[in-house]
């Protein structure tokens, strides 16, 4: 039950996270005009990964796309790439995790297959979240660098009568959406990986331990984990998993080196 809950919650958290990454990538407010020096501007500038916009007092907003690929800063291209990779990985992860969900039965899919798929999707979510966080952080760093550069320029070359206004940009809403979304996707991925551990069958599966009494042979078989009451004997103090959905009577007893004669 806890495994199903962890897996389900991981899926939902990742889903919200990836939706947030997509939203952040599409948003125009990655950087917004810094109003510290001029809080009464009649023209407000803001920029996204794909276009820059200007909002006038009337509410009229004009956006212009970056119709060049080669003319754009390498950092911006890198951020775009990181966000797209994050979205793609996240989308694939979501697709895989849907089939991995314990509450959804698809044919006769083994628990081991579901565990592998859960782990795969979890890793994908983690990488997706890291891509988003990295992309947003790179952009934020670029903003900070440009901010201080433009601040330095503001106080130089002002000897003449005419002043040129240097538009400074600060963090936009998309950065915070991106950070939160990346974090959620990362958390969701970790939850999926934790859930995978609960789904995976043990590598050494002690199906039965035979005790041979002198005179007549009696095999004592503790039930598999699904059927047992939890009081079965376990030589290594391990949980005993039953591979398939079989009844206790169908489990065969094999002699092993642990058999007591």
């Amino acid at each position: 039950m806890a495994v199903t809950a962890c897996q389900g919650l991981g899926f939902v958290v990742s889903l919200i996270g990836i939706a947030g990454i997509i939203a952040a990538t599409c948003m125009d407010q990655w950087s917004t005009q810094d109003l510290y020096n001029n809080p009464v501007t009649a023209v407000f500038n803001y920029q996204g990964l794909w276009r820059s916009c200007v909002r006038e007092s009337s509410g009229f907003t004009e956006c212009r796309g970056y119709f060049t690929l080669l003319g754009l800063p390498a950092m911006l291209q890198a951020v775009r790439a990181l966000m797209i990779v994050g979205i793609v990985l996240g989308a694939i992860g979501l697709l895989v995790s849907i089939f991995a969900l314990k509450c959804i039965r698809i044919g006769s899919m083994e628990d081991s297959a579901k565990a592998n798929m859960t782990l795969t999707s979890g890793i994908m979510f983690i990488v997706s979240g890291l891509c988003a966080i990295a992309g947003v952080s790179v952009f934020a760093n670029m903003l900070v660098t440009n901010f201080w550069m433009s601040t330095a320029n503001m106080y130089t070359g002002m000897g003449g009568m005419v002043q040129t206004v240097q538009t400074r940009y600060t963090f936009g809403a998309a950065l915070f959406v991106g950070w939160v979304a990346g974090g959620l996707t990362l958390i969701g991925g970790v939850m999926m990986c934790i859930a995978c551990r609960g789904l995976a069958p043990e590598e050494t599966n002690y199906k039965a331990v035979s005790y041979h009494a002198s005179g007549h042979s009696v095999a004592y078989k503790p039930g598999g984990f699904k059927a047992s009451t939890g009081f079965g004997s376990n030589t290594k103090n391990k949980k005993i998993y039953d591979g398939g959905a079989r009844t206790e009577d169908e489990v065969q007893s094999y002699p092993s080196k642990h058999d007591y004669v």
Epitope: Q33, V40, T164
Partner: antibody
Framework: EVKLQESGGGLVKPGGSLKVSCAAS????????MHWVRQAPEKGLEWVAY????????YSTDTVKGRFTISRDSAKHTLFLQMTSLRSEDTAMYYC????????????WGQGTSVTVSS | DIVMTQSPSSLTVTAGERVTMSCKSS????????????LTWYQQKPGQPPKLLIY???TRESGVPDRFTGSGSGTDFTLTISSVQAEDLAVYFC?????????FGSGTKLEIK
Amino acid sequence: EVKLQESGGGLVKPGGSLKVSCAASGFTFSDYGMHWVRQAPEKGLEWVAYISRGRSTTYSTDTVKGRFTISRDSAKHTLFLQMTSLRSEDTAMYYCARGSYYGNAMDYWGQGTSVTVSS
Amino acid sequence: DIVMTQSPSSLTVTAGERVTMSCKSSQSLLNSGNQRNYLTWYQQKPGQPPKLLIYWASTRESGVPDRFTGSGSGTDFTLTISSVQAEDLAVYFCQSAYSYPFTFGSGTKLEIK
């Protein structure tokens, strides 16, 4: 047809108060920001104040800050300018103007209302 | 605040003549975000309120005759009337629309001989 009609002007003593109004018609009043601009006799134009369409933002020139208040009643399609602590230099023709959708311009102007501050 | 300086303060021309008037701002009115200049031109005929002629430094308002042309960028702007008509007798004001408070130039009075 867009029409702006100012009213409420008149003669007032220094230190006195006056509230001028601007009745708007021919357009959706709540969709536009509105301005007050004044013109002293035989002088140039001076922008006084602005109120955004949502009524959330108001701006005014430093010379009237703390003395003049711009407001609007969208239900009545009316713009107001409450003037207090009036000075002789506030004597002017007061125009209300509609904020254009483009370029932060003022595309329609009223005929103006005259305000005289004199003892 | 942005200071707007207009020149000349007045000029007298004959009908059909080409006329240019200048407007300078103390600060650049060019917005980097959309590469538009936030300068507006108004015409005020005697006894009338001002009328919008040009916004964004060069975009004519609808209904304005095409003999009126705005040009310039940054801090230097010009209003040109290609062929002055008798009805163009007015005072022409430029206005900064980049940041509040909006400021107007002192005006250029156009007189017809």
